[in-house]
């Protein structure tokens, strides 16, 4: 396979990585598709240095990034461990709210107006971040 | 000046098989998602597949799903359709389309179309 | 899936009519919906993207409006090479479905 050396068009490189930032929005699963057909994956965060990265480019606004619970425990996109990694949410967050009146709990995590985390329906449609990163094989699959 | 030319298309019988291929020009092929679109005779457009640039990541309709498969050669710049187990309702102008702005699917350029027709 | 229906399913128009067409969305498209241009035997021309915003040498003429789950594409002035079926699509959720088109007939 190839590899990324520069970033696309329109993306933000930073620290080996590179980002795109949505303006409007769309459910956590169409970002998700969204942003895989961009061989990429919703923003994994894994530090507070990256933290402060996307909340200078996001600004105040609900963003989605790549981790969720939708089936069980909290899981990152890209396969970074949850447990030991970083985390940033607001304080008792993440509640896995019912009272929404949507149905069902908060599967899906986002970066709130000051950048801390909460969890939200899954379906809000919200803004997203793209990451992919840099010098990464490409997982293009031979053809028949 | 952007150009996809689709090929491959033709009759076939019921149960069988037929690869379509788009060759692309004008672009930086691999940087960008592509898409097979059809449309059977008298009905309006079915988006039918999609692919990463990079062939990482594909998507199907569940009309077509474990029967069609989607690849690229980004060497060759060239869009692959693989239709395995055609079907009668598989007859349809099938268009290849360039995404226009990232994932979103928007499709800002299109090819002419390859007909296929699955016929005993 | 998102279901498009389109409205009317045929128009018949004069060079120089207004012309409107309706999308209705079965959900909400967060302004995910784009319009086509079909003419037999050429390849489909992307007119509108983003529910408003007009393709790079698409004539003026052509615009788009709507929000929620409701659009509509407007030719201002129809002019002979505008004779053609018009298809919007949303882009918003995978499937991408279209409506099944708006056929612009000489009146």
């Known amino acids: 396979g190839s590899e990324r050396t520069c970033c696309p068009v329109n993306w933000v490189e930073h620290e080996r990585s590179c980002y795109w930032f949505s303006r409007s929005g769309k459910a956590w699963a169409d970002a998700d598709n969204y942003c895989r057909l961009e061989d990429a994956h919703l923003v994994v965060v894994t530090s507070w240095e990256e933290q402060k990265f996307v909340q200078h480019h996001i600004g105040p606004v609900n963003t989605w990034m790549g981790l969720h619970d939708q089936n069980g425990p909290w899981k990152w996109v890209d396969g970074t461990d949850y447990e030991t990694g970083f985390k940033n949410w607001r304080p008792e967050q993440p509640d896995d709210w019912y009272g929404h009146g949507l149905g069902g709990g908060e599967d899906c995590a986002h970066f709130t107006d000051d950048g801390r985390w909460n969890d939200d329906v899954c379906q809000r449609p919200y803004r997203w971040v793209c990451e992919t990163e840099l010098d990464k094989a490409s997982q293009e699959p031979p053809l028949l | 000046e952007v150009q996809l030319l689709e090929s491959g298309g033709g009759l076939v019988q019921p149960g069988g098989s037929l690869r379509l291929s788009c060759a692309a020009s004008?672009?930086?092929?691999?940087?960008?998602?592509m898409s097979w679109v059809r449309q059977a005779p008298g009905k309006g457009l079915e988006w039918v597949s999609a692919i990463s640039g990079r062939g990482g990541n594909t998507y199907y309709a569940d009309s077509v799903k474990g029967r069609f498969t989607i690849s690229r050669d980004n060497s060759k710049n060239t869009l692959y359709l693989q239709m395995n187990s055609l079907r009668a309702e598989d007859t349809a102008v099938y268009y290849c389309a360039k995404d226009g702005f990232g994932g979103s699917s928007y499709f800002d350029y299109w090819g002419q179309g390859t007909l296929v027709t699955v016929s005993s | 899936d998102i279901q498009m229906t389109q409205s009317p399913s045929s128009v018949s128009a004069s060079v120089g009519d207004r012309v409107t067409i309706t999308c209705r969305a079965s959900q909400g498209l967060n302004n995910w919906l784009a319009w086509y241009q079909l003419k037999p035997g050429k390849a489909p021309k992307l007119?509108?993207?983003?529910?408003?915003s007009l393709q790079s040498g698409v004539p003026s003429r052509f615009s788009g409006s709507g929000s929620g789950s409701e659009f509509t594409l407007t030719i201002s002035s129809l002019q002979p090479e505008d004779f053609a079926t018009y298809h919007c699509q949303q882009a918003n959720s995978l499937p991408w479905t279209f409506g099944q088109g708006t056929k612009v007939e000489i009146k």
């Open positions: 004008g672009f930086t092929f691999s940087s960008y998602a």
């Open positions: 007119l509108i993207y983003a529910v408003s």
